[in-house]
Each structure stands twice: as C-alpha cells, then as structure tokens.
Amino acid sequence: QQQTLPKPFIWAEPHFMVPKEKQVTICCQGNYGAVEYQLHFEGSLFAVDRPKPPERINKVKFYIPDMNSRMAGQYSCIYRVGELWSEPSNLLDLVVTEMYDTPTLSVHPGPEVISGEKVTFYCRLDTATSMFLLLKEGRSSHVQRGYGKVQAEFPLGPVTTAHRGTYRCFGSYNNHAWSFPSEPVKLLVTGDIENTSLAPEDPTFPADTWGTYLLTTETGLQKDHALWDHTAQNLLR
C-alpha cells in the first residue's frame, strides 16, 4: 500500500532571484484533489493553503509581498489528499538581491575577442564579501562561483561563439543574499567563420530569465510564468 503521494513541483515567479522589498510568488503544483498544501522554509512551516474546490485545482501560489533577507533561503512544499501526505518537493533556493553594494565587472583582454582567445572576467566589490557569482543571460546561465577578498577571477579559457552574450556578476554575502547586479558586459566573439553569422547568442533560450529578473528589479511587475534558473539553483546547494 502506498504510504506517500508523489512529490509536488516548486518554483518561483517571476524569478528565484528577488530584489529586496519586491514581491515574489512561490508556486507548488501537486495533484487534483489535494485539500491542503504546506510551504516549508528552512525546515519550519511557512504557510498553508487549502484550495477550493480541491478537485479542480492542482496548483497553489504563495505570495511574498516584501522580500527581505529573513525570507531568503530554501523552500519546499508538500500536499495532502485525505489523510495521505506527499513526499516533499525538491528544494527551491530563494535569493534576495540588491543587498548593500554594486560590484564592478570587467573583462580581459576586452569585450571583443577572437575565437580561441583566453578570456577572464573580473568581479570586484570593496565591501565585506569573499564570494562572487558570474551569470550569463539565458536559461543555461553558465553560473560560476569565484572567491577573493575584494575581487574574483573568472577564467573562461579559450572562447568560442558559445561564450558570446551578456554577463553580470554579484557579490554574495551568503548563499541566499546577493549584492546589486553589476552593470552588464557584452562579450563579442568573432572569427569562427562557420558559426558567426548563424549562431544566436544563446540558442537554448532568448534571455527571458534575466529579462524577467530586470522587470522585477525595475517595476516589481509580476509575470505569470515559471522561468527559473536550474544551473544557479544547483549551484546554491
């Protein structure tokens, strides 16, 4: 006899990276007929939702109107059908951004390079942090973590056109509290004759993940979709 129900899916809308004082929605999708959903935060019960009518609803949304560092961390959800509870969902890492300061991102030898050249990004932040994160726009996001007292190096090695795109970096005060994003640096890679004219910046995704984050940053507007960055999520574990 089955002792638990299948685990639900959890995600953040519009993004798992939330600027402080902005809103975010945590979504939990279970099964039709679930009479109760519970959202847990760092192992403690955070919120409860009882959908009505349960037989017509298989997803609930928990609204956080005012993101702050106390709410940054790991979330999971469970649901109940009758007396039977589900397995817990995977962990969702919710990150608060725009904390304290803005790092500076630079690239050596420069933003326009030839395919095969070695490229290194430098992220600098003078306030007390020792961890830095480099993100490239797009779903794949190529998140890298670097360390240094005030500056971290991110060597990309010999680049190809796949490295083309817009990069930003963050200083990280802990796994779930990040600085303001740096100004963007656009890396242009030329010289790969066969691919240069054909390859889009990120063939997997039209950079909407970052666009959604910027939308949150600038206006607090909610977009009702579930685009979140699996690479960065895994990096935080």
């Epitope: 919120a47 409860v48 939702d49 009882r50 009505k52 949304k61 609204y63 109107p65």
Partner: nanobody, 126 residues
C-alpha cells in the same frame, strides 16, 4: 501603510477567557492575511493562530481547541478568542498582517508578516 493596534489584554485566572482585538487602519484590510503571535518573558516569539482573506484558519498545536481566530472585514478587525487559559499562555500577544496576498494563503512563519502591532499583555495567574 498599515497600522495595527491590539487591545483586550489583561489579567485572568486559569480556566478563564479573554478576547483580543486588533484594529487595522487603511483600506487594505480585506486584502490582508492576519495572524497572532506571542512572546513570553525570556522566550522567542511564537506563532499562535492565523486567518486568510477567505477565512481559512490555522492554529498552533498548543492552542488548538482553546483559541479561535476570526475577522470582521467591515470593522477592519481581527479577533482572538481565548478560553481555558493556562499559566503558560502568559505572554505579550502581537497582531500581524501580510499585505497584499492571495485569498487562501495562511501564513505561519513570522518572517512572512510585513506589518506588526505593538502588542498587548495577557497574564494568567491564580
């Protein structure tokens, strides 16, 4: 901006009852999820009860069956009816709000609440 003012606290004997009220200012009360928390001397603030915009409720195990949370949107007020009071219920009781929120969200964790009252003292002793 939401302002919350608690009232109704006082001294009561074990087994007695009290009703706490929390009056909210502003026109956002109907879009708020509300909660009651308490803090006993020398202890951390703990969850007591919460109510969603759609009147769903959730209680701490320690008060289940003894306390009842309710709301009156016309009066912009949330209530905590406390009965069968015990010495361990002695604490400062705080009203809190999450504004805005979805209709059926009930918030249990104090970090979720973005507005707080100043508190009202409840003392239970013979």
């Amino acid at each position: 901006e939401v302002q919350l003012v608690e009232s109704g606290g006082g001294e009561v004997q074990p087994g007695g009852s009290l009703r706490l009220s929390c009056a909210a200012s502003g026109r956002t009360f109907a879009s708020a999820a509300m909660g009651w928390f308490r803090q006993a001397p020398g202890k951390e603030r703990e969850f007591v009860a919460a109510i969603s915009r759609s009147d769903d409720t959730y209680y701490a195990e320690s008060v289940k069956g003894r306390f009842t949370i309710s709301r009156d949107n016309a009066k912009n007020t949330v209530y905590l009816q406390m009965s069968s009071l015990r010495a361990e219920d002695t604490a400062v009781y705080y009203c809190a709000a999450v504004v805005p929120t979805y209709g059926s969200n009930i918030y249990v964790h104090s970090a979720a609440y973005n507005y707080w009252g100043q508190g009202t003292l409840v003392t239970v002793r013979p």
